[in-house]
Interface confidence: low
């Protein structure tokens, strides 16, 4: 047989035995001559180096470029391939020689002691046990131990080939410690040498790069990349790195096995790539591949190399953030920079510190945004190496869905006397201000909240027939006033009022306010009664410790059984969108009160007296009267507010002033308190008495001194007093100029 490609000028060496396979008996002599066109050499089995003592290679006597190989008394172990080749080329001729030695049918290995076969447990892999034969057509089986098992060729995945050895799926013998081949010749058994079975793994579980991502350096810094491969046991790993600048002067690669816990089912291998001083050309993708021979896994990471440390804001950095009250707000500091900058947040110039409501880090997070969070937020990035600073301002605008102020102090149901003019109010606070406030109405009987009617959360009204107030057919005549804007409790609010010109029918009124982030509504129960009427004596809000009487007046011919109740102590809360239950239908929430009955010619008057009213007396008072004929109950509710006693205070200061003779002085002293304080003026600690030149107006609030004279100069004191004490302010008035003599003098 010929091996290699024929050259243009060179023929293949020619063997004296023109066969691919030669079979000879043991103890005979093997002699083969090889002729060619240039220097030749021989290779033979078991000693590929050519120093075997028994083998003779001699120059032919009859020509140049000719060599004869001679082996006297061949043995089974001489079986194999004999190769004649031109030196320093691939051109060769080969013959396979079987030396039939029935006493030793297997060719012994070089060591003659034992061999080693390496196997993996992969079901798809086969292993070859190299028990080569000196006879080509032997019946060979494979013995494995322990426990003892015998495998015979099956014409499929188990086979024996004299030139190759015994082939078998590796998992079949992975349990064994050793194997050997056995041949039967004329009822005699012949065994090959023993082969120790070494199970090697191949499975790589994963390859992890550390750092795994986001690697950034500047020119001159050291790059250290760790590549860790986790494998099953009995695995050997080859690492291969791919990186942008392969011809790097300062590159260093160190591979080592890592210790794992005893009893661990895996091994770890580490390859560390180090580049001492990176350059811009080192930027790019770094890939680490771990190979076990049968399996390769790889992982990649991108390394960015910057010319020098820097910091800048990313293009996605916002300048305006809009949010609605209650939302979580996240403002990320989007930056480009190396190394990562120090980040500091400021609000209106004041540094922000993290707490349970705000987190000031790479992302400024406000857990539950409120109106007071509105403002300008400055983020300052500082490069930790170069100390370069960059700042950016983000404006946070917090929107508030419409909130209707009166909702918090709604009476469960207010009753209005038939025929009276009434004003209903909705005070709306919203950011941005509501773009509209609309009023709607519907008849009370169309929407009575009967206990039998199911009221769901999603549909709180048993009926939804709200009509626009422009359409007041069948209802009360209505007029909606133009919205007013008022500063209330320091907030700009929108006030919408609806005027009912004559309270003729009971109805429900709804105001609805809408802005860009939401809507708010208030439902007002407008119950019109021809029944009892409640009046307050004296006709004003009482202050703590004052006495007040609630009078319930009813026509004696129509009503009987007048009774006073108080709602509470904690009336059922009215949830957003729910209708208040008419109190007459729910007497369980009422407390009966003691009262005194008086009568005149036409009316019964039930008087409930509160002596020394306290803040606890505030609340809703209900007068119930029963129709004599129909026995229907009529209820009227009056909300009583008791004002807290407040000691006098004077708002604003009196200013020291200098005035010329003959001019006028006007000063104000505004006092507040409950009960309202009395105001008195003093000059040089003596009570100031009104005369033609000194005028006190508006309950002594305003003091005017006309045509001032020199003697008006002095210390002026405004004092506001009530039973709860006094407050005072002082100012010195200087009068300049000479006093003119008058005729009267």
């Amino acid at each position: 047989a010929s091996v290699g490609l024929p050259s243009v000028s060179l023929d293949l060496p020619r063997l004296s035995i023109q066969k691919d396979i030669l079979t000879i008996k043991a103890n005979t002599t093997l002699q083969i001559t090889c002729r060619g066109q240039r220097d030749l050499d021989w290779l033979w089995p078991n000693n590929q180096s050519g120093s075997e003592q028994r083998v003779e290679v001699t120059e032919c006597s009859d020509g140049l470029f000719c060599k004869t190989l001679t082996i006297p008394k061949v043995i089974g172990n001489d079986t194999g391939a004999y190769k004649c080749f031109y030196r320093e080329t691939d051109l060769a001729s080969v013959i396979y020689v079987y030396v039939q030695d029935y006493r030793s049918p297997f060719i012994a290995s070089v060591s003659d002691q034992h061999g080693v076969v390496y196997i993996t447990e992969n079901k798809n892999k086969t292993v070859v046990i190299p028990c080569l034969g000196s006879i080509s057509n032997l019946n060979v089986s494979l013995c494995a131990r322990y426990p003892e098992k015998r495998f015979v060729p099956d014409g499929n995945r188990i086979s024996w080939d004299s030139k190759k050895g015994f082939t078998i799926p590796s998992y079949m013998i992975s349990y064994a410690g050793m194997v050997f081949c056995e041949a039967k010749i004329n009822d005699e058994s012949y065994q090959s040498i023993m082969y120790i079975v070494v199970v090697v793994g191949y499975r790589i579980y994963d390859v992890v790069l550390s750092p795994s991502h986001g690697i950034e350096l500047s020119v001159g810094e050291k790059l250290v990349l760790n590549c860790t491969a986790r494998t099953e046991l009995n695995v050997g790993i080859d690492f291969n790195w791919e990186y942008p600048s392969s011809k790097h002067q300062h590159k260093k690669l160190v591979n080592r096995d890592l210790k794992t816990q005893s009893g661990s089912e895996m091994k770890k291998f580490l390859s560390t790539l180090t580049i001492d001083g990176v350059t811009r050309s080192d930027q790019g993708l770094y890939t680490c591949a771990a190979s076990s021979g049968l399996m390769t896994k790889k992982n990649s990471t991108f390394v960015r190399v910057h010319e020098k440390p820097f910091v800048a804001f990313g293009s996605g950095m916002e300048s305006l953030v809009e949010a609605t009250v209650g939302e979580r707000v996240r403002i990320p500091a989007k930056y480009l920079g190396y190394p990562p900058p120090e980040i500091k947040w400021y609000k209106n110039g004041i540094p922000l510190e993290s707490n349970h409501t705000i987190k000031a880090g790479h992302v400024l997070t406000i857990m539950e945004v409120s109106e007071r969070d509105t403002g300008n937020y400055t983020v300052i990035l500082t490069n930790p190496i170069s100390k370069e600073k960059q700042s950016h301002v983000v404006s946070l605008v917090v929107y508030v869905p419409p909130q209707i102020g009166e909702k918090s102090l709604i009476s469960p149901v207010d009753s209005y006397q038939y025929g009276t003019t009434q004003t209903l109010t909705c005070t709306v606070y919203a950011i941005p201000p509501p773009h509209h406030i609309h009023w709607y109405w519907q008849l009370e009987e169309e929407c009575a909240n009967e206990p039998s009617q199911a009221v769901s959360v999603t549909n709180p009204y048993p009926c939804e027939e709200w009509r626009s107030v422009e359409d007041f057919q069948g209802g009360n005549k209505i007029e909606v006033n133009k919205n007013q804007f008022a500063l209330i409790e320091g907030k700009n609010k929108t006030v919408s009022t609806l005027v009912i010109q004559a309270a003729n029918v009971s109805a429900l009124y709804k105001c609805e306010a809408v802005n860009k982030v939401g809507r708010g509504e208030r439902v007002i129960s407008f119950h019109v009664t021809r029944g009892p009427e409640i009046t307050l004596q004296p006709d004003m809000q009482p202050t703590e410790q004052e006495s007040v009487s609630l009078w319930c007046t009813a026509d004696r011919s129509t009503f009987e059984n007048l009774t006073w109740y108080k709602l509470g102590p904690q009336p059922l809360p009215i949830h957003v969108g729910e209708l208040p239950t008419p109190v007459c239908k729910n007497l369980d929430t009422l407390w009966k009160l003691n009262a005194t009955m008086f009568s005149n010619s036409t009316n019964d008057i039930l008087i409930m007296e509160l002596k020394n009213a306290s803040l606890q007396d505030q609340g809703d008072y209900v007068c119930l009267a029963q129709d004599r004929k129909t026995k229907k109950r009529h209820c009227v509710v009056r909300q009583l507010t008791v004002l807290e006693r407040v000691a006098p205070t004077i708002t604003g200061n009196l200013e020291n002033q200098t005035t010329s003779i003959g001019e006028s002085i006007e000063v104000s002293c505004t006092a507040s308190g409950n009960p309202p304080p009395q105001i008195m003026w003093f000059k040089d600690n003596e009570t100031l008495v009104e005369d033609s030149g000194i005028v006190l107006k508006d309950g002594n609030r305003n003091l005017t001194i006309r045509r001032v004279r020199k003697e008006d100069e002095g210390l002026y004191t405004c004092q506001a007093c009530s039973v709860l004490g006094c407050a005072k302010v002082e100012a010195f008035f200087i009068i300049e100029g000479a006093q003119e003599k008058t005729n009267l003098e």
């Epitope: 994963d206 991502h213 896994k297 990649s300 990471t301």
Partner: antibody, heavy 118, light 112 residues
Framework: SVEESGGRLVTPGTPLTLTCTVS????????MSWVRQAPGEGLEWIGT?????STYYATWVKGRFTISKTSTTVDLKMTSLTAADTATYFC????????????????WGPGTLVTVSS | AVVLTQTTSSVSADVGGTVTIKCQAS??????LAWYQQKPGQPPKLLIY???DLASGVPSRFSGSGFGTEFTLTISDLECADAATYHC??????????????FGGGTEVVVK
């Protein structure tokens, strides 16, 4: 193989437990995940229990669902169910190609249908 | 958390043709992406993992490519049996347990 069971029609608020039974591989060396698919919608990852028993959940779960396991089963306990939880629930074996936390799913169960309706 | 976007909800092609499905990640997920095929009434079937590795038993007509944020699944020599919905899935972990197992919205492949 992997097979889910326990899916049925329940009313809102009713708790429900789904069970995933595995064979042919060990839960002590494989992670298992629950994934759901609402009718006509895409796949939505619910959570994972790792081979060591650590659990990870999607943020939207918010404590409503709990994953636990025995030697051959993985349970998904679901509470506070609403109509939005109506879906086919799949159990899937996770393979860690890169690290202990990362899973793709080579083996899936046929799924079990949970319908939440009043 | 990683968000995967499959911009095309449906794509059609002829038998024997080639179809390309794209999946975009909201952040760098390296090659930690898998592709699944799902037919009506059946669970998803893994086709590709590690962005380009073919799962066991999957024909070589299916191939995956991409790295970082842009990924593509290509089906060549289209067969009728390839009509299905194809989902992409990220298994990138950035330190928050919420990041594991994000799926794309799915792309339906119609074979004409």
């Amino acid at each position: 193989s992997v097979e889910e069971s326990g899916g049925r029609l329940v009313t809102p608020g009713t708790p429900l437990t789904l069970t995933c039974t595995v064979s042919g591989f060990s839960l002590s060396s494989n992670a298992m995940s629950w994934v759901r698919q609402a009718p006509g919608e895409g796949l939505e990852w619910i959570g994972t229990i790792s081979s060591s028993g650590s659990t990870y959940y999607a943020t939207w779960v918010k404590g409503r669902f709990t994953i636990s396991k025995t030697s051959t089963t993985v349970d998904l306990k679901m509470t506070s169910l609403t109509a939005a939880d109506t879906a086919t629930y799949f159990c899937a074996r996770g393979d860690d190609d890169v690290s202990d936390y990362f899973y793709y799913f080579p083996i899936w169960g046929p799924g079990t249908l949970v319908t939440v309706s009043s | 958390a990683v968000v995967l976007t499959q911009t095309t909800s449906s794509v059609s092609a002829d038998v024997g043709g080639t179809v390309t499905i794209k999946c975009q990640a909201s952040e760098n997920i390296y090659s930690l992406l898998a592709w699944y095929q799902q037919k009506p009434g059946q669970p998803p079937k893994l086709l590709i993992y590690s962005a380009s590795d073919l799962a066991s038993g999957v024909p070589s007509r299916f191939s995956g490519s991409g790295f970082g944020t842009e990924f593509t699944l290509t089906i060549s020599d289209l067969e009728c049996a390839d009509a299905a919905t194809y989902h992409c899935q990220s298994y990138y972990y950035s330190g928050s347990s919420a990041d594991t197992g994000a799926f794309g919205g799915g792309t339906e492949v119609v074979v004409k």
